[in-house]
């Protein structure tokens, strides 16, 4: 469920949302870390109706559910979080 | 009291159309995701199809993609299910319910539901 | 899609008893687990969420457990009022149910 990408590429999220969406209808989450040409961090969410999202990092939400799928999950996420590096 | 209160149910043909409706009051309806389910004896219980609190984004299974049609009205404090090409295995009980609010909070409301029967 | 396989589907037991029913998920579904019971003519009650957390105004006879894939209902001195059917729900990924079990009176 959760894919951390390290990338050269500008932001990718020109708006973003910082309302709920239930974990259910959630089919992927991608945390742009900052830098590489993008000074914020983003995350990107896929809903399961193939629509996508940018989420405000800081709502509260998004925060409880990644760390709720951390501490469930117990070492092993339902998807592995994918890390990858581009010079 | 929250109250949730499905209409519109009845007999059908194969083919025909039928839209049910849902009556909520006791709460801030615009506040809550809002959902449909069903129960037919043979197949148990199913969810159909949900809807988020604004009505921008719908999600449905499967089955009934591209032929049901989840809807609501925050003024009215109302939720629809537009159901086309109605088929004989959509023949259940409808059940309208609530799920989570902006905080994550996922109460426990249901109607009382609305039978559909689909049959020539 | 998730696949609910609930057991046994019909249980037999006396007042007083102590009844476990579970539920298999064919994926992990990281706790994102209910129990409902449903009398007839009634529409489903929620008495657990989340795997172990008791809904407001159910009774502490009820409990689950479980993680992964395996979970578990608890009901510890069975009343006369529990005997109905139960379901488990999952709300990891959608919404699949299980199939049900019928909790009759022995």
């Known amino acids: 469920v959760l894919e951390v990408y390290y990338t050269s590429l500008r932001c990718r999220c020109v708006q973003e949302s910082s309302v709920f969406i239930p974990r259910r209808f959630i089919d992927r989450i991608q945390i742009l870390p900052r830098g590489n040409g993008c000074p914020r961090k983003e995350i990107i969410v896929w809903k399961k109706n193939k629509s996508i999202v940018c989420v405000d990092p800081q709502a509260e939400w998004i925060q409880r559910m990644m760390e709720v799928l951390r501490k469930r999950s117990s070492s092993t996420l339902p998807v592995p979080v994918f890390k990858r590096k581009i010079p | 009291e929250v109250q949730l209160a499905e209409s519109g149910g009845g007999l059908v043909q194969p083919g025909r159309s039928l839209k049910l409706s849902c009556s909520a009051s006791g709460f801030t309806f615009s506040d809550y995701y809002m959902a449909w389910f069903r129960q037919a004896p043979p197949k148990g219980l199913e969810w159909v199809a949900s809807?988020?609190?604004?009505?921008?984004?719908?999600f449905y299974r499967d089955s009934v993609k591209g032929r049901f049609t989840i809807s609501r009205d925050n003024a009215k404090s109302s939720l629809y299910l537009q159901m086309d090409s109605l088929r004989s295995e959509d023949t259940a009980t409808y059940y309208c319910t609530t799920e989570e609010d902006y905080s994550g909070s996922f109460p426990d409301y249901w109607g009382q539901g609305v039978m559909v029967t689909v049959s020539s | 899609d998730i696949q609910m396989t609930q057991s046994p589907s019909f249980l037999s037991a006396s007042v007083g008893d102590r009844v476990t029913i579970n539920c298999k998920a064919s994926q992990n579904i990281n706790k994102y687990l209910n129990w409902y019971q449903q009398k007839l003519g009634e529409a489903p009650k929620r008495l657990i969420y989340d795997t172990n957390n008791l809904q407001a105004g159910i009774p502490s006879r009820f409990s689950g457990s479980g993680s992964g894939t395996d979970y578990t209902l608890t009901i510890n001195s069975l009343q006369p009022e529990d005997f109905a059917t139960y379901f488990c729900?999952?709300?990891?990924?959608?919404?699949?149910f299980g199939g049900g079990t019928k909790l009759e009176l022995k």
């Open positions: 809807i988020s609190y604004d009505g921008g984004d719908s």
């Open positions: 729900l999952q709300h990891n990924s959608l919404y699949t």
